[in-house]
Structure formats: structure tokens, C-alpha cells
């Protein structure tokens, strides 16, 4: 498939409340574990069924998390990002970037990543 794939990038503030099994999603990425080439950002790799993020409905696999409770996630080691999520408290504010594919294209395989807390 040689056609160009276009993306619509939007940002959203999502307030999540921690459930019995945490925030209910896994993350990948970080300066030591780049998920996207030339991008050390933190991405959602998996939404856990019946967890907080799944029942809330706004966070999606593939979303980039820009900040947690106002704290920027740029240039963090993967484990530091995991710890930040785990220690983020009960009510967590996420600034996320959704990347919606406008034209159909091949979908890459996503690993499960680490729990966000």
C-alpha cells in the first residue's frame, strides 16, 4: 500500500480516578525504551478491560501521554515514568495526544508495556 496516511492530532485533558487495579492501562516508551523512532515520549500500549481507563472510555491505545498532574513526561526513563504514574495519587489528570488515522494504512503490532499504576 503506497498511499499516504494522514493523521489528525488532537489533545485532551482526561481526569481519571484510580480504581482497585490502578488506572487500568499499560505504558511504553521513555528515553531508554523508545517506542516511536526519534521520540522518547510515553505511549499507551494497552487498555485493561473493565479497568478505570476502559470504563471511562476516553483514553485509547496509541495515545501519547504528555503530562501527569501537570508534570511533563519529556525525557524520562521508562521506569521513572512508571513510578510517576504509580505515585500520581487518587485523582489523576492526564494531558494526552490522540493521533487519529484519516486514511486506512497498515497497523503495527503493539506490545503490552508496563502497568501505569
Amino acid at each position: 500500500m503506497n498511499g499516504r496516511v494522514d493523521y489528525l492530532v488532537t489533545e485532551e485533558e482526561i481526569n481519571l480516578t484510580r480504581g482497585p487495579s490502578g488506572l487500568g492501562f499499560n505504558i511504553v516508551g521513555g528515553t531508554d525504551q523508545q517506542y516511536v523512532s526519534n521520540d522518547s515520549g510515553i505511549y499507551v500500549s494497552r487498555i485493561k478491560e473493565n479497568g478505570a481507563a476502559a470504563l471511562d472510555g476516553r483514553l485509547q491505545e496509541g495515545d501519547k501521554i504528555l503530562s501527569v498532574n501537570g508534570q511533563d513526561l519529556k525525557n524520562l526513563l521508562h521506569q521513572d515514568a512508571v513510578d510517576l504514574f504509580r505515585n500520581a495519587g487518587y485523582a489523576v489528570s492526564l494531558r494526552v495526544q490522540h493521533r487519529l488515522q484519516v486514511q486506512n494504512g497498515p497497523i503495527g503490532h503493539r506490545g503490552e508495556g508496563d502497568p501505569s499504576g
Partner: nanobody, 117 residues
Framework: EVQLVESGGGLVQAGGSLRLSCAAS??????VGWFHQPAPEKRREVVA?????????YYTHFVEGRFTISRDNAKNTVYLQMNSLTPEDTAVYYC????????????WGQGTQVTVS
């Protein structure tokens, strides 16, 4: 045809209670959520959600302990019991449902007005 019909809204004094109902027809869903929209220019925000299959629940932090979401499988109905209501709870309440376990809610009811004086 999928239909979500809300009922139970109305005018109540601060400190009072209401029970909202969402009757679903046309499909068995994976998740059902209750959202509120305090004003037309504000976005709809989830207040509570439930997994139809597992019964797992999710509450946003500002209603936890006051609101309870439950389901009656035989009646294909989801309820939102709202206690200790405050004027800040005044909003149009929407029932939403999805047949996917994660991602945005695809089906929406028409909404029911709740006014707390």
C-alpha cells in the same frame, strides 16, 4: 435499532436523592456509562460506568461515595443512584453504551435533566 432511554431526572433539594434509569434495547453492551453535562458549552464528563459482563464499576472522584451505578440484566437496565446531591450536580445526565470493551462510547441517550436547588 439501538435505543437508550433515560428517566428519573427532576428537581430535588440539596442533600436529596434521585435514581436515574437507562433502559437499553436492541443489543447487549459491554459497558454502560452515565455522563453529565453541566451546561451546553461544557463537555460531557463520565461520572460512573459499569461493565455489563463483570459488574466492575468506575466512579469519578467527585461522586464516589455518593453515587452508585448498578445493572439489572433481566430488565436490560442500568441505574444511577444519586445521594447527597449538591447544586454542583445540576446537569443533563446522559446514558452511553458501547459494545466494545475499550474506547469511546458509541451509543447515547437523549439525556435527562437533574436540577439541585
Amino acid at each position: 435499532e439501538v435505543q437508550l432511554v433515560e428517566s428519573g431526572g427532576g428537581l430535588v433539594q440539596a442533600g436529596g436523592s434521585l435514581r436515574l434509569s437507562c433502559a437499553a434495547s436492541g443489543r447487549t453492551f459491554s459497558r454502560v456509562g452515565w455522563f453529565h453535562q453541566p451546561a451546553p458549552e461544557k463537555r460531557r464528563e463520565v461520572v460512573a460506568a459499569i461493565s455489563w459482563r463483570s459488574g466492575d464499576t468506575y466512579y469519578t472522584h467527585f461522586v464516589e461515595g455518593r453515587f452508585t451505578i448498578s445493572r439489572d440484566n433481566a430488565k436490560n437496565t442500568v441505574y444511577l443512584q444519586m445521594n447527597s446531591l449538591t447544586p454542583e450536580d445540576t446537569a443533563v445526565y446522559y446514558c452511553a453504551a458501547s459494545d466494545k470493551s475499550t474506547g469511546p462510547y458509541e451509543y447515547w441517550g437523549q439525556g435527562t435533566q437533574v436540577t439541585v436547588s
